[in-house]
């Protein structure tokens, strides 16, 4: 069964069949005797009850209010009322683009990675029994596909597949021909599965320190799940008991990559910790990125240009 219309704000294109289905449908069947009413309000008109006599374009079936077709003047608020249950929708009917096979404001955008599986299936479950034929267009040019009931594209994406794909369903109702259009804007992008990991911030960092004090060197990177971030430092410092690597912290980015941070803590800084490279590396199978930290005694700061310092 077709799911109910739960979105409270709906935009549709003039001239197409359209329906609203309330969300207490199963309940309505149980209490057949209960009075069920549909209302519309727009501008000056408050809560006008709808029935087939209101307009030859309107049909009521159990849980559904149908428009054959929907027109610009159908814009407004719609209410379904049954006992103490009310559902409300705000309907905005927009003008059809007469110069194109689709209306730009009614396009669903999809991003597909090159070489990944790409599928478009033309289906419309609600009007399925009324559909005579369906055509699929790419950039408003009809594609010749075998199945004219549910045309489908299934392939590995190529850059040439980018474009606007419109499924147009043709159906008859009361002797009239209607069509319903669903358009997808398909953008083909480079494979995003792996990024080249990168460390954030300058590649060389002089850090002003005082002997006997502690310092925390923070290394942050943008990387893939399988990538690693680690510290390497001079061989003579390899087993320095005053050097500690803190636990790595990771946060997932909205794009599905990772932001990682790893701190090297040097306690009780001694002469042996000065002027040696502490290297932080992020590594993947595709490459590495390294940034270096050098501890410099505060007294020696004057010898180094200010722009190379991190504090």
């Amino acid at each position: 069964a077709e799911s109910c219309t739960s979105r409270p704000h709906i935009t549709v294109v003039e001239g197409e069949p359209f329906y609203l289905k309330h969300c207490s449908c199963s309940l309505a069947h149980e209490i057949e005797t209960t009075t069920k009413s549909w209302y519309k309000s727009s501008g000056s008109q408050e809560h006008v009850e709808l029935n087939p006599r209101s307009s030859s374009r309107i049909a009521l079936h159990d849980c559904v209010l149908e428009f054959w077709p929907v027109e610009l003047n159908d814009t407004g608020s719609y209410f379904f009322q049954m006992k103490n249950y009310t559902q409300k929708w705000k309907l905005n009917v927009i003008r059809r683009n007469k110069h194109s096979c689709f209306t730009e404001r009614q396009v669903t955008s999809k991003i597909v990675e090159v070489k990944k599986f790409f599928q478009i299936t033309c289906e419309n479950s609600y009007y399925q029994t009324l559909v005579n034929s369906t055509s699929l267009y790419k950039n408003c040019k009809k594609l010749l596909l075998e199945n004219n009931k549910n045309p489908t594209i299934k392939k590995n994406a190529e850059f040439e597949d980018q474009g606007y794909y419109s499924c147009v369903h043709f159906l008859h109702h009361n002797g009239k021909l209607f069509n319903i259009t669903k358009t997808f804007n398909i953008t083909i992008v480079e494979d995003r599965s792996n990024i080249v990991p990168v460390l954030l911030g300058p590649k060389l960092n002089h850090v002003a320190v005082e002997l006997g004090k502690n310092v925390r060197l923070n290394c942050s990177a943008l990387l893939n799940e399988e990538d690693v971030i680690y510290w390497m430092f001079g061989e003579e410092n390899g087993s320095d008991p005053n050097i500690h690597e803190e636990k790595e912290m990771r946060i997932m980015t909205p794009e599905g990559k990772w932001h990682a941070s790893k701190v090297l803590r040097i306690e009780n800084i001694g002469e042996s910790n000065l002027n040696v490279l502490y290297n932080c590396t992020v590594a993947s199978t595709g490459g590495t990125d390294t940034k270096s930290f050098i501890l410099v005694r505060k007294a020696d700061m004057a010898d180094i240009p200010g722009h190379v310092f991190t504090r």
């Epitope: 390497m232 390899g238 590594a283």
Partner: nanobody
Framework: EVQLVESGGGLVQAGGSLRLSCTTS????????MGWFRQTPGKQRELVAR???????SYADSVKGRFTISRDNAKNTVYLQMSSLKPEDTANYLC?????????WGQGTQVTVSS
């Protein structure tokens, strides 16, 4: 393609020992720094021990004094001697090169320490 093959894991009682091996087919093994990483489900890989081409070693605080990393360049193998094992050492152990692009990860070798 260069392959990394880890072995030597198993089930051991707390306080016990294991010796892990990692063999690579890489022709640059003798000049690569190598590291042992470990990973527990849902966590990122943590570098626990590293060894430079010159044989200098360093360790994560959590394993210092208990784990020893070594290498045999003639056999293209790096080892991790693990002693005084603790339940928190339970993980999948993997090796890889350091300081250069990672080799494709091996399957790892599972170490389980029971209390």
């Amino acid at each position: 393609e260069v392959q990394l093959v880890e072995s030597g894991g198993g089930l051991v009682q707390a306080g016990g020992s294991l010796r892990l091996s990692c063999t690579t087919s890489g022709s640059t093994f003798s000049i690569d720094a190598m590291g042992w990483f470990r990973q527990t489900p849902g966590k990122q890989r943590e570098l626990v021990a590293r060894i430079t081409n010159g044989g200098s070693t360093s360790y994560a605080d959590s394993v210092k004094g208990r784990f020893t990393i070594s290498r045999d360049n003639a056999k293209n193998t790096v080892y991790l001697q693990m002693s005084s094992l603790k339940p928190e050492d339970t993980a999948n152990y993997l090796c890889n090169v350091l300081g250069t692009a990672l080799r494709p990860w091996g399957q790892g070798t599972q170490v389980t320490v029971s209390s």
